[in-house]
């Protein structure tokens, strides 16, 4: 149940996909990855106001309880709903190989 | 890749399963749910310090980039890794029915 996509906080303030440029050094991968030298990391960033992109019933409950008990129950959080695969060329004990990672780059986002 | 379960912030401070007691009124369900009158809502609450219960490679990247760019990239967030099903007795147009919800109660938690 993907709820409202209208952000009440203003354009671009709510949970959505962002791209962050990162080097192998930034990611702590320089000792085991050869390529790429830089990654366009897609990640989910932004606020999750009431029912905005609620992933499921749990997210709706969380919103309700956060409104009642904000010090106890956090607001829903902006996280990946799905991922895009990515390949890395990496060093291994047996040499260089290509490895596909399915859980590295966010494809789209929701609140949970 | 479920990383370290040791919480560096002290016992109970990191991402884990919490139970919050909530009435139908609290949840905004009073007009369509008959039973239960109260729900023991299990949800994921707590901090996600470096590599604590990292759900996947994306969570590890997020940790690295949060350390570098804390104002741009948020820390990973404590969310359900899986759910426990729950039944609700609910009012419908044709009377009362039993409905199972698979995405209502968190079963265990991870950081993403």
């Amino acid at each position: 149940a993907r709820n409202g996509d209208h952000c009440p906080l203003g354009p671009g303030r709510c949970c959505r996909l962002h791209t962050v440029r990162a080097s192998l050094e930034d990611l702590g991968w320089a000792d085991w990855v050869l390529s790429p030298r830089e990654v366009q990391v897609t990640m989910c960033i932004g606020a999750c106001p009431s029912q905005f992109r609620a992933a499921n019933m749990h997210a709706q409950i969380k919103t309700s309880l956060h409104r009642l008990k904000p010090d106890t129950v956090p607001a829903p959080c902006c996280v990946p709903a799905s991922y895009n695969p990515m390949v890395l060329i990496q060093k291994t004990d047996t040499g260089v190989s290509l490895q596909t990672y399915d859980d590295l780059l966010a494809k789209d986002c929701h609140c949970i | 890749a479920r990383n370290g379960d040791h919480c560096p912030l002290g016992p109970g401070r990191c991402c884990r399963l919490h139970t919050v007691r909530a009435s139908l009124e609290d949840l905004g369900w009073a007009d369509w749910v008959l039973s239960p009158r109260e729900v023991q809502v299990t949800m994921c609450i707590g901090a996600c310090p470096s590599q604590f219960r990292a759900a996947n490679m994306h969570a590890q990247i997020k940790t690295s980039l949060h350390r570098l760019k804390p104002d741009t990239v948020p820390a990973p967030c404590c969310v359900p890794a899986s759910y426990n099903p729950m039944v609700l007795i609910q009012k419908t147009d044709t009377g009362v029915s039993l409905q199972t919800y698979d995405d209502l109660l968190a079963k265990d938690c991870h950081c993403i």
Epitope: S35, P36, N84, P85, M86, V87, L88, I89, L98, T100 | -
Partner: antibody, heavy 118, light 112 residues
């Protein structure tokens, strides 16, 4: 297991247009970092890079042949198509497609042999 | 385009003996980030080329460790410590510092 297979005519006449298809399996051309390239090898000679296409639809053409080449992909069919116009006998060669991952060219097709002759 | 020049163009080696192939580029292949964009391929008789060496000195997984590669910015050497019958074919050096990627003219290795 990664496999690539080139298909196309064995013979074309001068001035005609060549269409080659690379059909692949074992990887997806929607994966970040992945591309498919075309390379040719005239009989008894070395390798020449023609063109490549990336997961994000960025394309590269060898400058010397750019006006004659078009590369495209159909991700759902796992195919990459190269067209080459105004064929000439000097274009007689074995044409290979290959999988790229950034600068890592690790899997090649078996090649398709083309003769340009009237 | 960067020109790659190989020597010798053919080589006949007794099994168990070492072999060495040289490659020279018309421009330094050492990038400012410290990577040398030089590659070695082997095309066995009747087959398509296979990658042996990645970024000058990294052996590809599955390639026997009797193969090694070294060099500077413009002068490179592929060495086979003990030639075996399965090593016959045409060896190509290639560069990928600049587009288009370009190949040497090839060195044919035969067994005596």
């Amino acid at each position: 297991q990664v496999t690539l297979k080139e298909s196309g005519p064995a013979l074309v006449k001068p001035t005609q247009t060549l269409t080659l298809t690379c059909t692949f399996s074992g990887f997806s051309l929607s994966t970040y970092g992945i591309g498919v390239g075309w390379i040719r090898q005239p009989p008894g000679k070395g390798l020449e890079w023609l063109a490549h296409i990336w997961w994000n639809d960025n394309k590269y053409y060898n400058t010397a042949l750019k006006s004659r080449l078009t590369i495209s992909k159909d991700t759902s069919k796992n195919q990459v198509v190269l067209t080459m116009t105004n064929m000439d006998p000097v274009d007689t060669a074995t044409y290979y497609c290959a999988r790229l991952a950034y600068d890592y060219v690790d899997s090649w097709g078996q090649g398709t042999t083309l003769t340009v002759s009237s | 385009d960067i020109v790659m020049t190989q020597t010798p163009l053919s080589l006949s080696v007794t099994p168990g003996q070492p072999a060495s192939i040289s490659c020279r580029s018309s421009k330094s292949l050492l990038h400012s980030e410290g990577i040398t964009y030089l590659y070695w391929y082997l095309q066995k008789p009747g087959q398509s080329p296979q990658l042996l060496i990645y970024q000058m000195s990294n052996l590809v997984s599955g390639v026997p460790d009797r193969f090694s590669s070294s060099g500077s910015g413009t002068d490179f050497t592929l060495k086979i410590s003990r030639v075996e019958a399965e090593d016959v074919g045409v060896y190509y050096c290639a560069q990928n510092l600049e587009l288009p990627p370009t190949f040497g003219q090839g060195t044919k290795l035969e067994i005596k």
